[in-house]
Amino acid sequence: PPRGRILGGREAEAHARPYMASVQLNGAHLCGGVLVAEQWVLSAAHCLEDAADGKVQVLLGAHSLSQPEPSKRLYDVLRAVPHPDSQPDTIDHDLLLLQLSEKATLGPAVRPLPWQRVDRDVAPGTLCDVAGWGIVNHAGRRPDSLQHVLLPVLDRATCNRRTHHDGAITERLMCAESNRRDSCKGDSGGPLVCGGVLEGVVTSGSRVCGNRKKPGIYTRVASYAAWIDSVLA
């Protein structure tokens, strides 16, 4: 099943997020992703846990997953590079870099997103945008078109309360509020964008969605700048 959903959001403006990627397994949407360089898409490591021998591809320039669109391009993956410290049973280091088989043709609907390199927490309350093709309600309806939602960043201390994530949120992770509006498993690997800059990647750990006591968890890309640079080099 696809990992992730946007809850309480709305359909995104078509092609207004040209960095948005759909990571696909055997032709079906699996996870979100974000184009960070001409030949590289950043996603979540857990996304490929169940991929085994399946064919992994990346769809760029898409709004609708099913409809033909002038800007849609499907790229094969040359290699998948999960973070070396990612593990199946934890949400830590949940990052994956996918090298496309060729450089993406950049244009109005396909552009890399600048990512945060300054390792500083985003101010609590900052409104950030998260987008994805994940399930849109608890009944499991999957959208065909890209959805998005604006979420305020939640401070780490609150997120780490016993009633919330009970100390699991390290300095390399960040949280966003989850009161009915939320990202969830199916949006894993997708971007959390604050002020036009990629700040976080949706983690793919299993958690309840849309419950304010269980905020959304995002991997802070700035904390992994050295690793990202070393892989892209």
Epitope: H15, P18, P68, P70, S71, T105, L106, G107, P108, A109
Partner: antibody
Framework: QVQLQQPGTELVKPGASVKLPCKAS????????MQWVKQRPGQGLEWIGE????????NYNQKFKGKATLTVDTSSTTAYMQLSSLTSEDSAVYYC???????????WGQGTTLTVSS | DIQMTQTTSSLSVSLGDRVTISCRAS??????LNWYQQKPDGTVKLLIY???RLHSGVPSRFSGSGSGTDYSLTISNLEPEDIATYYC?????????FGGGTKLEIK
């Protein structure tokens, strides 16, 4: 309404450079790419390159690298194409065109006729 | 570079005719094809994008079709204002390339 204004004619000497403007109005300039296209007298259309005014990322036709330089001035919502070391081969009509997410140019300027002559 | 060939450079037509203009790509361009109209005064307009999609404001007498390497533009009932040169253009692979154009001329 969307308008792309280009001067009608430019006359320059061989070896010189020229900077052709394309003044955009009626839309948010930084939200759309701009393409440039060449048409020699009696000939077809030839794609030169395209620029994203929001961050000046450019795709060039390799054939025009070193000949054409694309720039923008967002404050005046104007795109420019500079052509250098001009020869008679550069005499042509040059069009600017707004390039959109449908991967086509939906509005075109009237074109500037460049004449390179001593 | 992908070569786009419009074998018919000029076509003698009559008003009311059904006119079909062909375009062939040197390799499969998977429907990444647009059609433009250039009037005798130099004005250029987008007619069809993505092989068959009519651009807004373009009369429904214009239609596009094709796949793989072979594409066509059809004008179902030629009007006086359709006298122009028509160009196909691929955007499958950089650099984007145009066909040589097909000029419609009244018989």
């Amino acid at each position: 309404q969307v308008q792309l204004q280009q001067p009608g004619t430019e006359l320059v000497k061989p070896g010189a450079s020229v900077k052709l403007p394309c003044k955009a109005s009626g839309y948010t300039f930084t939200s759309y790419w701009m393409q440039w296209v060449k048409q020699r007298p009696g000939q077809g259309l030839e794609w030169i390159g395209e620029i994203d005014p929001s961050d000046t990322y450019i795709n060039y036709n390799q054939k025009f690298k070193g000949k054409a330089t694309l720039t923008v001035d967002t404050s005046s919502t104007t795109a420019y194409m500079q052509l250098s070391s001009l020869t008679s081969e550069d005499s042509a009509v040059y069009y600017c065109a707004r390039y959109t997410t449908i991967m086509a140019s939906d509005y075109w300027g009237q074109g500037t006729t460049l004449t390179v002559s001593s | 570079d992908i070569q786009m060939t419009q074998t018919t450079s000029s076509l003698s037509v009559s008003l009311g005719d059904r006119v079909t203009i062909s375009c062939r790509a040197s390799q499969d361009i998977t429907n990444y094809l647009n059609w433009y109209q250039q009037k005798p005064d130099g004005t250029v307009k987008l007619l069809i994008y993505f092989t068959s999609r009519l651009h807004s404001g373009v009369p429904s007498r214009f239609s596009g079709s094709g796949s793989g390497t072979d594409y066509s533009l059809t004008i179902s009932n030629l009007e006086p204002e359709d006298i122009a040169t028509y160009y196909c253009q691929q955007y499958s692979k950089l650099p984007w390339t145009f066909g040589g154009g097909t000029k419609l001329e009244i018989k």
